[in-house]
Amino acid sequence: SEGRKTWRRRGQQPPPPPRTEAAPAAGQPVESFPLDFTAVEGNMDSFMAQVKSLAQSLYPCSAQQLNEDLRLHLLLNTSVTCNDGSPAGYYLKESRGSRRWLLFLEGGWYCFNRENCDSRYDTMRRLMSSRDWPRTRTGTGILSSQPEENPYWWNANMVFIPYCSSDVWSGASSKSEKNEYAFMGALIIQEVVRELLGRGLSGAKVLLLAGSAAGGTGVLLNVDRVAEQLEKLGYPAIQVRGLADSGWFLDNKQYRHTDCVDTITCAPTEAIRRGIRYWNGVVPERCRRQFQEGEEWNCFFGYKVYPTLRCPVFVVQWLFDEAQLTVDNVHLTGQPVQEGLRLYIQNLGRELRHTLKDVPASFAPACLSHEIIIRSHWTDVQVKGTSLPRALHCWDRSLHDSHKASKTPLKGCPVHLVDSCPWPHCNPSCPTVRDQFTGQEMNVAQFLMHMGFDMQTVAQPQGLEPSELLGMLSNGS
């Protein structure tokens, strides 16, 4: 995903930030109103300009500055750690007028044995340690406080939780003589929530637990536990919801089977099976009860865990997710795609679509991509004419004052948005594809031909001539 080069070279990082004590809770914040864009769809740009100008004119009247940065807070409870024993933490940007809180779980694969964790530690240490984290991060996409970039929840309290546990946010084991690494992903989330209660979360109306990739799977694994935690701590009125982006994987048959040697070629079922033991992973209780002991790995797969969840969850998933293709040993590297592989890819999209059939709140464009919600251009993709921020807004409305999605969809405000066209990038609003080798942008027609799709076969079901279809796709229609 874009805009995420935040590492600092050794010797260039600032001194570690001081561990700040929790600020006393401010007076009861006033709820800000969700924006309803129903009437302004046609003239969104000028509406946004007005909103921004209004927002900026109000800034001098408040304690907030127009500062996009989220600030690092290392956990006060230093026994809740990253893999290497350094304290876990979170980045926070408060929005005192809002009772909405967005907690975002970062992604970044995982490691599942000593060897690949050692190698990860020596090449991707920021995903295993907080030692070199920068003091601040810029909020992008759904974490942005700019209404043009984030028309959905720009005014929310933004929390970014860095992924440093390598366990798909599921682990509950600490570093010891026996364990070289701690795997505390599930505990990190609990501790962050606990600390945020002292920073204003206690007055929240809605807590949206969001995440991308491994963080998206982390949402599915932790959303009910967070709701339960808040209930037990005496905050039953906070509505907990989930937004899982690019974390809804299939335990399908790999295109080419390979032995489980490293993280990216190991079949997902086998990687998770091994990982769960190595991490002492925990899964949602209601899901765990559905499977025998030793079969908890099933709960890492969205279509199996989702039906057991109590909290409402919105699922965002590219139908042709690059991480899914990677674990399935599909590597699109510029060579024309053979028919067997083309059929495999098409079938993957079909299977994914089928698993989302009974997910009322979902957004699944037929694109080849990975992650979306913290991309700056997350507003660009549409399914059936509806953008993701708009779909999320409709979802909010459908959940208004209730903990479960209402059965009747709001008129003109859809929340179940799954592309039905059958091939990658048949949706013209998909992110631009670049030729892997020339780096040149490809239009949809070029991409499909490059993928080995026969235009005759593609055009026929649409009732079009291949030349007509090519013309339409080239024009992005």
């Epitope: 600092r8 530690y121 020596d122 995903l127």
Partner: antibody, heavy 119, light 111 residues
Framework: DVQLLESGGGLVQPGGSRKLSCAAS????????MHWVRQAPEKGLEWVAY????????YYADTVKGRLTLSRDNSKNTLFLEMTSLRSEDTAMYYC????????????WGQGTSLTVSS | DIVLTQSPASLAVSLGQRATISCRAS??????????IHWYQQKPGQPPKLLIY???DLESGVPARFSGSGSGAAFTLNIHPVEEEDAATYYC?????????FGSGTKLEIK
């Protein structure tokens, strides 16, 4: 100043053994994964082996597997490469390199030690 | 194993002109927003020297005429404007997974 200094090269008979060393200074050795990279005369770079920062994981290129043993002594800031059953194709300049932990790139290289396998 | 194919094997560029070297991986070396491709320069009798890391970040002390780009499986090293001292062999290297591998090298000659 960050420095890596290889030693132990020289002339060895085919089938013979040799132990190369790499002495590190100017940085916390135990913080970094270390690698050996070799270069045959007039040829390109070939990655040979990796030792994790704690020394608990080692990984070898297929071309050398079974004939090389990589180890490190973090208390002495030294990396070792023990080579057995040497062949003429092992003739090369052997470099020890430090891998940056925010990407795995080699941000520091030694000057190399030359090994010749010949009868 | 990931195979890196570097091209061209050699090139001659006039002083002040642009040199472009390509590196293709047999599968994607990008993940979680980072591309694990790095570029080195090697002159005869010397060890390699890091120029570009993580596809596009310039190593400190390296002149700004060196730049890197690309993602997924396709990467490029550009040198512009080329200077006399840039005559050397250039290698790409991936650290996405073990085993690490290098490209076969590109020898740059200044005309």
């Amino acid at each position: 100043d960050v420095q890596l200094l290889e030693s132990g090269g020289g002339l060895v008979q085919p089938g013979g053994s040799r132990k190369l060393s790499c002495a590190a200074s100017g940085f916390t050795f135990s913080d970094f994964g270390m690698h050996w990279v070799r270069q045959a005369p007039e040829k390109g770079l070939e990655w040979v082996a990796y030792s994790s920062s704690g020394g608990t994981t080692v990984y070898y290129a297929d071309t050398v597997k079974g004939r090389l043993t990589l180890s490190r002594d973090n208390s002495k800031n030294t990396l070792f490469l023990e080579m057995t059953s040497l062949r003429s194709e092992d003739t090369a300049m052997y470099y020890c390199a430090r891998a940056s932990y925010d990407g795995g790139y080699f941000d520091c290289w030694g000057q190399g030690t030359s090994l010749t396998v010949s009868s | 194993d990931i195979v890196l194919t570097q091209s061209p094997a050699s090139l001659a560029v006039s002083l002040g002109q642009r040199a472009t070297i390509s590196c293709r991986a047999s599968k994607s070396v990008s993940t979680s927003g980072y591309s694990y491709i790095h570029w080195y320069q090697q002159k005869p009798g010397q060890p390699p020297k890091l120029l570009i890391y993580l596809a596009s970040d310039l190593e400190s002390g390296v002149p700004a005429r060196f730049s890197g780009s690309g993602s997924g499986a396709a990467f490029t090293l550009n040198i512009h404007p080329v200077e006399e001292e840039d005559a050397a062999t250039y290698y790409c290297h991936h650290s996405r997974e073990l085993p690490f591998t290098f490209g076969s090298g590109t020898k740059l000659e200044i005309k």
